[in-house]
């Protein structure tokens, strides 16, 4: 069914992330200890590493298309700020139709 | 074929709590693509959305800021209804309150509407 | 809160008429915007989702457009059935809020 899928999917995105975030903290020179918001996996989509006071936007994950294959892509933005990560914004929930992943267990 | 049908009283005295069901017909209020929202209208607010509850694998709800300190809507499954409770009434409170479903389509639209209730809040 | 604003507040047509209605909104609200119609005495009806896809049922005289903070309703060719007030709302940013209205009466 359709969730089955979208389980597959969003381990699949989850591993590319985890990776996607290795490459990019070796190509800023982030580490631990770097001022800035590292990159992350929300359970939804992936955060890309960022400096204090950069904007981050990115399409709603590739779930959303197949719920609708004919839309535009919602978008969804942090800011990383000294504290750290904002809350997204808009809404997940809003922009792209739901704010969390359910599996079927 | 959708349908929501509203009922409750349609007078409340100040302080007191507006209390109203919408019965869902052909369709679930445990869906996983729908919400269940509240709306009302007035003279001198127009349309104003105030709430929705939802389940996906849990209940949630997200409230206008405007009366979160004063909304519940909860959902009743045994019955496929949901209702909205609003305390502590004042006449401003007055108004035709609406429920309606929530849909997601590119983005989250009311397709069906209640009937429509108007509640006057007067001692 | 995104307040939205339409124009005209009312207006006057004949049947057979195109009319444009326009709707802002206080800020960017990329095409999360829907368009119901509603008589009185009755619930408001949604016509128009996601700034321009027109609901099932809906006659195609009816169209949307617009994306950002602008956006238009187009009747073409007003039919009797069609005075009405006429709602925008936002449907991006809690509280998702409807515009003023716009009353359409017979000339």
């Known amino acids: 069914g359709s969730m089955a899928h979208s389980d597959g999917i969003f381990k699949k995105e989850q591993a590319m992330c985890l990776e996607k975030i290795q490459r990019a903290n070796e190509l800023m020179g982030f580490n631990d200890s770097s001022p800035g918001c590292p990159g992350m996996w929300d359970n939804i989509t992936c955060w890309k590493p960022a400096h204090v006071g950069e904007m981050v936007l990115v399409s709603c994950p590739e779930l959303f298309r197949i719920f609708n294959p004919d839309q535009d892509m919602g978008v969804v933005s942090r800011n990383c700020t000294e504290d750290g990560w904002s809350e997204p914004f808009p809404h997940y929930f809003d922009a792209c139709g739901f704010d969390e992943y359910e599996s079927e267990t | 074929q959708v349908q929501l049908q509203q009922s409750g009283p349609g007078l409340v005295k100040p302080s007191q709590t507006l209390s109203l069901t919408c019965a869902i017909s052909g369709d679930s209020v445990s869906s996983r693509q729908a919400t269940w929202n509240w709306i009302r209208q007035s003279p001198s607010r127009g349309l104003e959305w105030l709430g929705r509850t939802y389940y996906r694998g849990k209940w949630k709800n997200h409230y206008a800021v405007s009366v979160k300190s004063r909304i519940t809507i909860n959902p009743d499954t045994s019955k496929s209804q949901f209702s909205l409770q609003l305390n502590s009434v004042t006449p401003e409170d007055t108004a035709v309150y609406y429920c309606?479903?929530?849909?997601?389509?590119?983005?989250?639209?009311?397709?069906?509407w209640g009937q429509g209730t108007l509640v006057t809040v007067s001692s | 809160d995104i307040q939205m604003t339409q124009s005209p507040s009312s207006l006057s047509a004949s049947v057979g008429d195109r009319i444009t209605i326009t709707c802002r909104a206080s800020q960017s609200i990329s095409r999360y915007l829907n368009w119901y119609q509603q008589k009185p005495g009755k619930a408001p009806k949604l016509l128009i989702y996601a700034g321009r896809i027109l609901q099932s049922g809906i006659p195609s005289r009816f169209s949307g457009s617009g994306s950002g903070t602008d956006f238009t309703l187009t009747i073409n060719s007003l039919q009797p059935e069609d005075f009405a007030t006429y709602f925008c709302q936002q449907a991006i940013i809690n509280p998702y809020t409807f515009g003023p209205g716009t009353k359409v009466d017979i000339k």
């Open positions: 309606a479903r929530g849909m997601w389509q590119g983005n989250w639209f009311l397709d069906h």
